[in-house]
């Protein structure tokens, strides 16, 4: 049948209209809609949301919108008991204490419910000790603390600035270092852009300004007392002690004015090097403890937050494939907030309302995907994934079997130089042939191709003449479709300059800052940013959904393979003696990416010359394209993750944010030289590039013909 | 089975250049990733280069980077390293390598003056 089938729209139309359809107009009354109150998850407001956005998606004319709800572990500080730090004298007393909120932003003075700052899951404790100063906590950092200048950060609390990785694996990192509690802080290095003023008259984070977030490492497992299985009515619940990924130790955030009152005390060791030295006027002294005149002054936490099981809610709107209405293409973002979420999530939220209304439009006009679209809007992203993974879980077996691709819609910009996409090798070419046919929004690339300008600005470190594509890690919705169900997924956002601006992430995130006149006035004002993602966004999943041969290339896999290959090979030739005494070869591998190659490329060959009107031939090398992503899924998932299951993508165990190419391998060579039995370590280095290699060879052969 | 034959070592001056070679037999080259490792008098093995299956991905250890280039010509089967700006510590018998299993003989470099 032709992919036209309940349409009245010529293909070629079909993408056009779509696109023309898209109206910047649009996005920015919407994102001003989403913006005006704090949608929290677990809360009335972010309850109300979800029903006005249900309502306004069966506007739209999608065929259904239901609410999906879940119980899961939230967590929130105590109203009448707030969190703050202080420094104690020697007799106790509270000589500083750290501020219990932040100050609002302008014409958000009255509004009410605004979370203060605080770190999600955070249990509850006093610890009162001295102070340890250690960088970004990320394990280099620890390695230095530890191996090189003998510190001991056991029973002491560590101050560690955000930035560089997810600070869930700061707090894990804190944790096995013996710490008792972690203060974090945002330095203005990181989070100050020079040359900019902090909101309200720029987009830099004032000094009273703090990043909130959660501090879990739930290792894609989703609501903490319900792994694997969907938090339903009838859920069994573990009890607290044996949640999944809760911090040990209380954890609070606070900015850079009560982090200088902290660190200008500091004393002890000296910084290692100029890495470790912000931009306070402090000397950024390790510790630990303070210094002479203050050496008998403490740091003292006081955490009260609570954790609670709390109901969300998912919308999960369809619109219905007129072909193949047995294979889903997901188009997901959340809609929960810190605070206002000016840019997360809401600048995401309003582009995926704008492409729902969009093809609503097309649908009233009587056209139908050939395949099925499926619209979410996620609760609970802030507080772990949750609202994703928990309908994941409870739709594995549907996913599993009909999942062509899932494409996030987080925040649509982190800054406005030019494109940043991490997706899956299948979806390279998509991207490719997608933005070649999209206007650049650029300055000085007037009449030129989004994907000219990408490829000006963010060229490939590998490719001459192509845009960089980076690896999925985590920290978003994507997360349990790609690294647990192993389904195609891919994420597009506007990003600032990595080389100009080596500040973590942009300097407002998480904070009451991040207002709708913070996009309005300094990052889109015309939002022809916000457009052109919309326009990616929604070209990428009006491609998968209605291509008559799914828009995969699996010949980019290949190459990749073989690139991930050559790089783990070198970090273990790294210890020649080593590979040599335990005889360690890279043969099967090597040799299992050079099969993948070749049939990867005869498939390829296939896929041009079969004949496109044979119904049952057509699907056949659909689902080998659709099935390849799930092939590269170990049943038994990576080594104490069972919930990353990707064998060839992870995120890495050292930043949840980052993606780590063939982890199980990465991660048996990492920090080896220190392993008690060596024997033992590089028997698991052999043992996970037979994982490796043997995933290779299985994934390739499903797409030798069939018989 | 498979076989690689080093050449190419001598005696050279401080600051002088040579060109290592390996010629590799047995396997199909072209499909795996390479390495150079030496080992210096009465010390254990060292990592010095390793590079994939074009010359666009190559690894250095950090006391040869900006001094020495591996390179490989698949149509030869042949490995390369180029060694410029010779140091008295790079003295060596430097070995190409397959991986853990599959070594050459080695060949020796000698850096003095």
């Known amino acids: 049948k032709s992919s036209n089938e309940a349409t009245n729209i010529t293909p070629k139309h079909n993408m056009k209209a779509f696109l023309d359809e898209l109206k910047a107009e649009n996005i920015k009354k919407f994102l001003y809609n989403f913006t005006q109150i704090p949608h929290l998850a677990g809360t009335e407001q972010n309850f109300q949301l979800a029903k006005q956005i249900q309502s306004q998606w069966k506007e739209f004319g999608l065929d259904s919108v239901e609410l999906a709800h879940y119980d899961v572990l939230l967590s929130y500080p105590n109203k009448t008991h707030p969190n703050y730090i202080s420094i104690i004298n020697e007799d106790g007393n509270e000589i500083f204490n750290t501020s219990l909120f932040e100050p609002p932003p302008p014409g958000y003075e009255n509004v009410s419910d605004i979370v203060p700052p605080f770190s999600a899951f955070s249990p509850q404790g006093m610890p009162e000790g001295d102070l340890v100063y250690v960088n970004y906590a990320r394990t280099e950092d620890f390695f230095k603390l530890e191996r090189d200048m003998k510190i001991n950060c056991s029973g002491k609390i560590v101050i560690a600035r955000y930035g560089k990785v997810f600070r869930g694996n700061k707090v894990k990192n804190a944790q096995l270092a013996g710490a008792k509690g972690v203060i974090l802080y945002s330095d203005p290095a990181d989070y100050f852009a020079p040359g900019v003023k902090s909101y309200p008259d720029g987009w830099n984070l004032p000094g009273g300004g703090v990043q909130r977030g959660n501090i879990l490492n739930l290792n894609g497992a989703g609501d903490p007392l319900t792994p694997g299985y969907p938090a339903n009515e009838y859920a069994y619940r573990r009890g607290i002690a044996e949640a999944v990924g809760l911090p040990s130790i209380p954890v609070h955030p606070i900015g850079y004015y009560d982090a200088q009152k902290l660190l200008e005390k500091m004393g002890g060791s000296a910084p290692p090097d100029s890495s470790w030295r912000g931009s306070l006027k402090v000397p950024y002294n390790v510790g630990p403890g303070f210094t002479g005149n203050f050496s008998t002054q403490k740091v003292k936490m006081h955490i009260h937050s609570t954790n609670e099981v709390t109901r969300i809610y998912n919308v999960i709107g369809t619109l219905r494939g007129a072909v193949e209405p047995d294979r889903y293409v997901i188009l997901g973002g959340h809609r929960d907030s810190w605070v206002f979420g000016g840019i997360d999530p809401q600048s995401g939220a309003a582009v995926v309302h704008e492409i729902v209304r969009s093809f609503g439009t097309l649908k009233k006009e009587g056209w139908r995907p050939r395949r099925t679209i499926l619209f979410a809007s996620w609760d609970a992203e802030e507080f772990g994934l949750l609202g994703s993974t928990e309908w994941a879980e409870e739709n594995s077996r549907l996913l599993q079997e009909r999942g062509v691709a899932y494409i996030n819609a987080d925040s649509s910009i982190e800054g406005n130089y030019t494109l940043r996409v991490d997706c899956t090798p299948l979806m390279y070419s998509l991207v490719h042939n997608l933005t070649k046919e999209l206007k650049s929004p650029d300055e000085g690339f007037e009449g030129k191709s989004l994907y000219e300008s990408w490829t000006k600005k963010s060229p490939s470190p590998e490719f001459s003449g192509m845009p960089r594509i980076s690896k999925l890690g985590s920290g978003n919705d994507f997360e349990v479709f790609f690294q647990r169900l192993g389904i195609a997924s891919g994420r597009a956002r506007y990003t600032k300059n990595w080389e100009t601006n080596k500040f973590s992430g942009y300097p407002l995130y998480h904070s009451v800052y991040e207002t709708y006149e913070l996009v309005e006035k300094f990052y889109d004002p015309m939002f022809k940013y916000h457009l052109t993602v919309a326009q990616v966004r929604g070209g990428m999943v009006f491609e998968l959904a209605n291509s008559i041969v799914l828009p995969f290339d699996c010949r980019d896999y290949a190459v990749v393979l073989r690139k991930y290959a050559d790089k783990i090979y070198s970090i273990s030739m790294k210890h020649p003696q080593e590979m040599k005494t335990y005889s360690v070869s890279f043969d099967s591998l090597f040799s299992a990416v050079k099969n993948f190659t070749e049939i990867a490329s005869k498939f390829s060959e296939r896929l041009q010359d079969f004949d496109k009107s044979n119904p049952i031939v057509l699907r056949m090398m659909n689902d080998q394209l659709m099935f390849l992503e799930r092939a590269f899924i170990d049943p038994l998932g990576l080594p104490d993750r069972p919930f990353y299951r990707h064998v060839i993508y992870a995120p890495s165990s050292h930043n949840k944010y980052a993606g780590e190419s063939f982890p199980g391998i990465y991660d048996a060579l990492f920090d080896i030289e220190s392993k008690v039995d060596p024997s033992k370590a590089w028997g698991e280095v052999k043992r996970q590039i037979y994982v490796a290699a043997f995933t290779v060879q299985a994934a390739a052969e499903t797409l030798s013909e069939v018989a | 089975q498979v076989q690689l034959v080093e050449s190419g070592g001598g005696l050279v001056q401080p600051g002088g250049s040579l060109r290592l070679s390996c010629a590799a037999s047995?396997?199909?080259?072209?499909?795996?990733?390479m390495s150079w490792v030496r080992q210096a008098p009465g010390k254990g093995l060292e990592w010095v280069s390793s590079?994939?299956?074009?010359?666009?991905?190559?690894y250095y250890a950090d006391s040869v980077k900006g001094r020495f280039t591996i390179s490989r010509d698949n149509s030869k089967s042949t490995l390369y390293l180029q060694m410029n700006s010779l140091r008295a510590e790079d003295t060596a018998v430097y070995y190409c390598?397959?991986?853990?299993?599959?070594w050459g003989q080695g060949t020796l470099v000698t850096v003095s003056s």
């Open positions: 390598a397959k991986d853990g299993v599959h």
């Open positions: 590079i994939g299956d074009n010359n666009r991905t190559t």
């Open positions: 047995g396997f199909t080259f072209s499909s795996y990733a």
